[in-house]
């Protein structure tokens, strides 16, 4: 069964989202130390940006917009040529539509002129400076920044933002970097200190964890990567489920193998941990589906729905595990491990 | 690394059955729908068909349906497409491919087989 | 069958400057799970195909961003920001939603 994770962790997202938000975009000023009135525009920007992130409900939209802004920060860190930042625009873009489904549109507006004066801001600094070991150590701190369950914990942390924030505000000049690096100390403790519910490279949606793999094995293989990573393929348990996961395969264009199959009994679909398929879940199928052409017994997400699919293929996979308490009792709050890695292919 | 090692270039005469083969590396063989592409000089591309080496079944496009037979032999990782009663028609350049199943693609080219059918 | 149309037929280029081929096709290529599976293709100059776009508009690993994808329905357009030398070829237009599966005739692209 899925484990809760405790309620101070819904009741503080507000908080989580600003800090993630600030460091996310700190991320990528720390990478252009060159031009100190530029950083200050930016420094503005996040400002306002972080107050109208901490104001809003929604945490599952929401979310969605914080992934699609770490990729922008991403983005933005690797791609200094004014030429390559397409991909920013597209990231935009997709922000806005998702913008334009929440409530609240008034504060979306808000956050998305922010964003888009934040966008042009950067689009105009030049090219990134030798800051790679900084922006290497913020990317470790935003990932474990993203979960932050406790209130007291939170403060600490957005305290240090605060003053590396400053600093970096002050220093134009390389030489006085050595400032940088204590703050990031300070701060790299701070987290290290915090639970993690879900591991590094992980997605975190409703108390449980999601693996979204990058390379591609069998339906069978995928369960074995599953199971050697202490998950199991997924299982779909609800509507708002399946929406978070046919929007994460069908936005990264992959066909992704999921834990449903009709191999026991051909036209009965079973989930791998036994579990029947529910009627009500049969409207995920696309149309025509399942067609069993060819014997096809796994199920796949594909494009809008669900398609089956002959299960000695090569897809992406999705695994799924409940997210971690944290508890102190239960000795959860460990240090930031590396990612589990993808299981090398079969 | 992916790589498709097709057979080289052959001459029959008309109406002599001819085979050709496609040996593939470097991912699981089994895990891969295997494709045929036609170009005939100085023209375009035809998809032929397909072959899944896991159990041998195979897709034809139903304008080759009675010119081309596809088969594997999983021992080695080949799969093979004997073209029957060849004319001048079936003169061309001859591409297996592999279809990704994760992005639905022809994500791997093997270099090319040519035939040339003349008497 | 889906019969797949490019134009023009040869794109004369120089080198810097930016071009853009033409791709329709006879019917709706969208799929039954709500995709297009509308790709392109670059033939270079004796070699075999290889893959530049799927799915309409997503650059496939390794491609370079100057290359663009565009369109929906029965209309699709392959754009080139600006113009190198390894970019001269015959580019081929696909379709994958519909069997049989369907090339275009192609476009040559090559140096004025």
């Known amino acids: 069964q899925v484990s809760k994770v405790p309620s101070s962790i819904s009741q503080e997202q507000s908080r989580q989202d600003a800090i993630y938000q600030n460091l996310t975009q700190l991320k990528a000023a720390v990478g252009e130390l060159s031009e100190k009135s530029k950083l200050q525009e930016i420094y503005q920007e996040l400002t306002q940006l972080k107050a109208a992130v901490g104001e809003l409900p929604e945490k599952s939209k929401l979310q969605e917009i914080y992934q699609e802004l770490t990729r922008l920060k991403a983005a933005v860190g690797e791609l200094p040529e004014k030429s390559k930042l397409q991909e920013i625009y597209q990231e935009l873009t997709w922000l806005k539509a998702a913008v334009g489904e929440l409530p609240e549109k008034s504060k979306m507006q808000e956050i998305y002129q922010e964003l888009t004066r934040l966008k042009a801001a950067v689009g105009e600094l030049p090219e990134k400076s030798k800051q790679q070991e900084i922006y290497q150590e913020l990317t470790r701190l935003k990932a474990a920044v993203g979960e932050l369950p406790e209130k007291s914990k939170q403060q600490e942390i957005y305290q240090e933002l605060t003053r590396l924030k400053a600093a970096v505000g002050e220093l134009p000049e390389k030489s006085k970097q050595q400032e940088i690096y204590q703050e990031l100390t300070q701060l790299k403790a701070a987290v290290e200190r915090l639970c993690h519910p879900c591991p590094w490279e992980w997605t975190f949606f409703q108390g449980n964890c999601y693996f979204m793999s990058n390379s591609q094995r069998n339906w069978h293989d995928s369960i074995t990567a599953c199971k050697e990573v202490g998950a199991q393929l997924v299982v779909i348990k609800s509507a708002e489920e399946q929406n978070f996961l046919q929007l994460q395969s069908s936005r990264s264009n992959r066909f992704t193998w999921m834990g449903l199959s009709d191999l026991n009994q051909e036209g009965t679909w079973q989930w791998v941990d036994g579990s029947p398929l529910l009627p009500s879940f049969k409207q995920y199928w696309n149309r025509g589906e399942p067609n069993n052409v060819g014997e096809e017994d796994c199920a796949e997400f594909s494009g809008n729905g669900w398609n089956d699919d002959k299960c000695n293929l090569a897809k992406f996979w999705i695994c799924k595990k409940s997210a971690a308490s944290c508890s102190r009792d239960e000795e959860q709050f460990l240090s930031p491990a590396p990612a589990t890695p993808n299981p090398p292919p079969a | 690394q992916v790589q498709l090692q097709q057979s080289g270039p052959q001459s029959v005469r008309p109406g002599a059955s001819v085979k050709i083969s496609c040996k593939a590396s470097g991912y699981s063989f089994t895990s891969y729908w295997m494709g045929w592409v036609k170009q005939r000089p100085g023209q375009g591309l035809e998809w032929i068909g397909m072959?899944?080496?896991?159990?041998?079944?195979?897709r034809l496009n139903q304008e080759f349906k009675d010119k081309a037979t596809l088969t594997v032999d999983k021992s080695s990782s080949t799969v093979y497409m004997q073209l029957s009663s060849p004319t001048s028609e079936d003169s061309a350049i001859y591409y297996c491919?592999?279809?990704?199943?994760?992005?639905?693609?022809?994500?791997?080219w093997g270099q090319g087989t040519t035939l040339t059918v003349s008497s | 069958d889906v019969l797949m149309t490019q134009s023009p037929l040869s794109l004369p280029v120089s080198l810097g400057d930016k071009a853009s081929i033409s791709c329709r096709s006879s019917q709706n290529i969208v799929h039954s799970n709500g995709d297009t599976y509308l790709e392109w293709y670059l033939q270079r100059p004796g070699q075999s195909p290889k893959l530049l776009i799927f799915?309409?508009?997503n650059r496939f690993s390794g491609v370079p961003d100057r290359f663009s994808g565009s369109g929906s329905g029965t209309d699709f357009i392959l754009k080139i920001s600006r113009v190198e030398a390894e970019d001269l070829g015959v580019y081929y237009c696909?379709?994958?939603?519909?069997?049989?599966?369907?090339f275009g005739g192609g476009t040559k692209l090559e140096i004025k």
């Open positions: 799915k309409v508009s």
């Open positions: 696909f379709q994958g939603s519909h069997v049989p599966w369907t």
């Open positions: 491919v592999r279809r990704n199943g994760g992005y639905y693609v022809f994500d791997s």
């Open positions: 072959i899944d080496p896991f159990d041998s079944e195979s």
